[in-house]
């Protein structure tokens, strides 16, 4: 019996506006029909969470108003977006997954993806 | 700094119920599942429950599944575990324990000893 | 349910030796194993985590290895504060399960 695994891509490029989209999918031990997503963030062995959606199988995800992400699910596999990121956010971004019902209850964490964040350069002033 | 501090365990008769509660302070609550585990006199460490996040996914080992009730306050950042028709075989210390954002129990409280015993 | 087992139960070490514990699970587990370190009258203290890394603030001798079902916990050189016991703990799938303890005292 192999254990849950979770696939994310290792390196991502955020946009020039500040937009950083990757999928994370897993593999499941058995037939679950409410998964939550997390996102953490690690930086100098520091993990945070950025944000974080339970979603019932078949139905979309939903983070809160206030969060940073958005996302879409279709079966085993998250689209994930994360919006308003600068250079300074730049480190590894971790999706873990949660098996949370039926039980038994069950972990799978990915390697992480490594987004970078590049501030664009301020337009120059032009005179006409 | 992360603290969590248990309470309310006791001298208890056989058949009868108990409270414990865990206060927890220094960190987003809500975002951590809370476990109970405990250990009997001279013996390992045994998990009791898990209580996920909002309070609605819990999960109970099956030695006191239909006896014990795991639950939280989110507003007020506490932990609770309702003993009910206690054994002698509960006789232990227990313990809460937060998990990590990742895996593994990062802190856990210092301990409440519950005794059964007629 | 996973089952965990340890070996050896116990063990007695000279201060400066290297001591390795090791402790199996019943079913893959991937890398979701922990190690904790208890001293007697106090709660246990979280060591490693996911079978390999470093929890915060503890001392770098000791290292995690392992995944899928066999794991190790090595103390490279042991110290005075190093005796105590030393538990397992899969975080994988309910209900969550420790291993029976090994017991490090001093030879």
């Known amino acids: 019996c192999k254990a849950m695994h979770v696939a994310q891509p290792a390196v991502v490029l955020a946009s020039s506006r500040g937009i950083a989209s990757f999928v994370c999918e897993y593999a499941s031990p058995g037939k679950a029909t409410e998964v939550r997503v997390t996102v953490l963030r690690q930086a100098d062995s520091q993990v945070t969470e950025v944000c974080a959606a339970t979603y019932m199988m078949g139905n979309e995800l939903t983070f809160l108003d206030d969060s940073i992400c958005t996302g879409t699910s279709s079966g085993n596999q998250v689209n994930l977006t994360i919006q308003g990121l600068r250079a300074m956010d730049t480190g590894l971004y971790i999706c873990k997954v949660e098996l949370m019902y039926p039980p038994p209850y069950y972990l799978g964490i990915g390697n992480g993806t490594q987004i970078y964040v590049i501030d664009p350069e301020p337009c120059p002033d032009s005179d006409f | 700094q992360v603290q969590l501090v248990e309470s309310g365990g006791g001298v208890v008769q056989p058949g009868r119920s108990l409270r414990l509660s865990c206060a927890a302070s220094g960190f987003t609550f809500s975002s951590h599942g809370m476990h109970w585990v405990r250990q009997a006199p001279g013996k390992g460490l045994e998990w009791v429950a898990v209580i996920w996040y909002d309070g609605i996914n819990k999960y109970y080992a099956d030695s006191v599944r239909g006896r014990f009730t795991i639950s939280r306050d989110n507003s007020n950042n506490t932990l609770y575990l309702q003993l009910n028709s206690l054994r002698a075989e509960d006789t232990a210390v227990y313990y809460c324990?937060?998990?990590?954002?990742?895996?593994?129990?990062?802190?856990w409280g210092q301990g409440t000893l519950v005794t059964v015993s007629s | 349910d996973i089952q965990m087992t340890q070996s050896p139960s116990s063990l007695s070490a000279s201060v400066g030796d290297r001591v390795t514990i090791t402790c199996r699970a019943s079913q893959s587990i991937s890398s979701y194993l922990n190690w904790y370190q208890q001293k007697p009258g106090k709660a246990p203290k979280l060591l490693i985590y996911?079978?390999?890394s470093l929890q915060s603030g503890v001392p770098s001798r000791f290292s995690g290895s392992g995944s899928g079902t066999d794991f190790t916990l090595t103390i490279s050189s042991l110290q005075p504060e190093d005796f105590a016991t030393y538990y397992c703990?899969?975080?994988?799938?309910?209900?969550?399960?420790f291993g029976p303890g090994t017991k490090v005292d001093i030879k």
């Open positions: 324990a937060r998990n990590s954002l990742l895996t593994g129990w990062d802190y």
């Open positions: 703990q899969q975080s994988y799938s309910t209900p969550f399960t």
């Open positions: 996911a079978a390999s």
